[in-house]
Interface confidence: low
């Protein structure tokens, strides 16, 4: 929707004659008729499809036209249209002599025409006036014209409707191209979505107005990032609302049962080791020289026979000392000085003498390690899982837990890229070795068929009431040339019913 504006500036008819050459008596009382229509390569008579306008008598013979209301007429002249501006036009300006006060066509003699000009061409929507001057043998007309959009209409063709608003349905102003520009604190396609307090949890918080953070049920805190645990939860936390996940050492529905008596009460004395053995129960493992439930009683350190492999124990003031037999050493004579003759290699390891038999080295079979081949190899140490998969030991074998998008024993296979239906507008997806390709249907292009390509806008027969359809190939839009008695962008309205649709 917009307005074609025509500003008449000066008309020169020095001899005061009509187009026929006959002079006006007493002078040419001049008024103008303007006809705006769709583009024609050769401007011909016919309906003024874009509108008509007439002026009152503006002057006699030669005169300048003031750029305001003049004798009740408007200057610039306004030719409103309520369709998408096609970017091209034809314009006919006729200067007529009015012998009397009745300016209706039927009231004028046919030879009252002073001059007639016809132009056509392209005209983009914009604020700038195009100045033109048309000269005939007897007359000269200077004028300028432009096309501007109506209020609330924007874009190159005045086809985008945008009304600024700040209410339940949106909070925005309109940009020059008709796109919405959200007011501060609002977002979304129609700026209906408030921008919550910075850091407000995306899922657990929300807001009804900007810079607010309201918590959904089960969540709390300034940013709604703290869940509310179950009522009565004593020694527990939650990761989702109404949970009660017990802290270490606590059990029961409300985490009020003490499972870690050792930590909470330290019952074992004299450096003993405490082990929890159930709710409120524990076991103390005493250091040598102590006994009792809580290792609270001291005894002779040699009473516990701490020396192994036949070592003899000697009490000392600050403890005890083991005298080891030949071939053994260590605090409790627990280490032996072995050689290959003692078969020290376990799990089928081979023994190799070193330093002339003073010590040895074990060569372990696969899956075993350690100085005596006593340790089983962790199958996951070689990290066999590809593409960031997680390796899990499962008995004698191993398995890989794959990241999303990968599969196979070792996560070596990509899940089909086409599974996500990435091709828009009905495009066909083809899996390739390193990606995918979309084959687009007619009328669409781009890597994902997201680009609408040029189509014949008239193909769908959008014009009603036997109107003629013209395609504007530069914008893929159409213009309907209405038959007499109908108006509207699709010629859908009988004359006298100006359309005003919000849709």
């Amino acid at each position: 929707s917009g307005v074609f504006q025509l500003q008449l500036q000066e008309f020169i008819n020095e001899r005061g004659v009509l187009a026929s050459g006959r002079p006006c008596e007493p002078g040419c009382r001049t008024f103008f008729r303007v006809c705006l229509k769709h583009f024609q390569a050769v401007v011909s008579p016919g309906p003024c499809t874009f509108g008509t306008v007439s002026t009152p008598v503006l002057g006699t013979n030669s005169f300048a036209v003031r750029d305001d209301s003049s004798g009740g007429g408007r200057n610039p002249l306004q030719l409103p249209f309520n369709f998408t501006w096609p970017g091209t036009f034809s314009l006919i300006i006729e200067a007529w002599h009015a012998p009397g006060d009745d300016l209706r066509p039927e009231a004028l003699p046919p030879d009252a025409l002073i001059s007639k000009i016809a132009i056509q061409g392209s005209l983009a929507v914009g604020q700038n006036w195009l100045l033109d001057e048309q000269t005939s043998t007897l007359t000269r007309l200077r004028y300028s014209y432009r096309v501007i959009c109506s209020d609330n209409y924007y874009g190159d063709n005045c086809s985008r409707l945008c009304k600024k608003r700040n209410d339940h349905f949106g909070h925005y102003v309109c940009q020059p191209d008709g796109n919405l520009s959200c007011l501060p604190g609002w977002t979304g396609e129609y700026c209906q979505q408030p921008i919550c307090l910075s850091g407000c949890h995306e899922q657990n918080g929300y807001c009804s107005k900007p810079a607010e953070c309201l918590c959904r049920p089960g969540w709390q805190g300034r940013l709604c990032n703290e869940c509310i645990p179950h009522n009565g939860c004593r020694h527990g936390t939650c990761s989702t609302p109404w949970q009660c996940t017990c802290d270490e050492g606590w059990g029961g529905l409300f985490c009020d049962q003490d499972l870690n008596y050792c930590t909470h009460h330290s019952p074992c004395k004299n450096g003993a080791t405490c082990s929890n053995s159930g709710q409120r129960s524990y076991t103390c493992t005493c250091r040598p020289g102590y006994t009792g439930v809580d290792c609270e009683l001291e005894l002779s350190e040699c009473d516990s026979n701490p020396c192994r492999n036949g070592g003899s124990c000697k009490d000392q003031e600050d403890g005890y000392h083991c005298l080891c037999p030949p071939g053994y050493y260590g605090l409790h004579c627990e280490h032996s000085t072995l050689s290959c003759a003692d078969s020290p290699c376990f799990n089928g390891g081979s023994c190799r003498e070193r330093n002339q038999g003073a010590n040895y080295a074990c060569e372990c079979p696969p899956n075993f390690t350690g100085s005596n081949c006593e340790k089983k190899v962790d199958r996951c140490t070689s990290n066999p899982c590809a593409n960031g998969g997680q390796c899990l030991n499962r008995g004698p074998s191993r398995m890989c837990r794959c990241r999303p998008g990968f599969t196979g024993t070792y996560c070596e296979l990509h899940v089909s890229d086409c599974a996500r239906n990435p091709c828009a507008h009905g495009g066909t997806c083809h899996d390739l070795e390193n990606g995918l390709m979309c084959t687009c249907p007619a009328g669409f292009s781009g890597r994902r068929c997201e680009v609408r390509t040029s189509i014949d806008a008239c193909a769908s027969s959008p014009c009603f009431n036997r109107a003629t359809c013209y395609t504007d190939l530069s914008t893929d839009t159409f213009v309907c040339n209405c038959p007499y008695g109908f108006v509207g962008s699709r010629c859908e309205f009988p004359v006298g019913l100006p359309p005003s649709f919000p849709w």
Epitope: D167, F464, P499, P502, W503
Partner: antibody
Framework: QVQLVQSGSELKKPGASVKVSCKAS????????MHWVRQVPGQGLEWMGI????????SYAQKFQGRVTMTRDTSTSTVYMELSSLRSEDTAVYYC???????????????WGQGTLVTVSS | QSVLTQPPSASGTPGQRVTISCSGS????????VNWYQQFPGTAPKLLIY???QRPSGVPDRFSGSKSGTSASLAISGLQSEDEADYYC???????????FGGGTKLTVL
Amino acid sequence: QVQLVQSGSELKKPGASVKVSCKASGYTFTSYYMHWVRQVPGQGLEWMGIINPSGGSTSYAQKFQGRVTMTRDTSTSTVYMELSSLRSEDTAVYYCATDYYDSSGYVDFDYWGQGTLVTVSS
Amino acid sequence: QSVLTQPPSASGTPGQRVTISCSGSSSNIGSNTVNWYQQFPGTAPKLLIYRNNQRPSGVPDRFSGSKSGTSASLAISGLQSEDEADYYCAAWDDSPNGPVFGGGTKLTVL
């Protein structure tokens, strides 16, 4: 809050005209289009037309062309629907309803008046 | 004769799930979005679902809408006695240019 208050019930003779009013409050009157919808007793809803309170422009359903006139008075935030050449089959409850729209182009009769019963009988 | 076609009646027992269909054409449901309205006897209709599947604030999530091609449907889960009402579907029709309604479905809770 948004409120649409309609005029009271009317009893009319065939051939006469009726003018129903709908007074809006609680929002910017010129920001929203207004529909008129009627419901014949025991039957469904039927759209009659729409008016833009800002400029006063209208669009009427084909069925009511020439018989219906929708106007507005911005000073009182009121829209009017006048139906002429009444017939007995025009006996119905007439509703006004605000319309919110955006570029996705959906019909959204968001708030409704309480309805006005028009009875046409000789 | 309504432009959009709805079954004249539907019924269900409390707690049940019921669906109401609405059939149209390419010029209405096929190319535009669908709204659903609830109407109790003697009162004005109330917007229940807009833009095919959006619920205005205050409408319980027991009500849901969907659209496929030239048809739409309204689903009510966990049926309650207070859901007994008339339900209408509506869509803009490109030809003629204006909103069209379904004939309405009377829902009875047994």
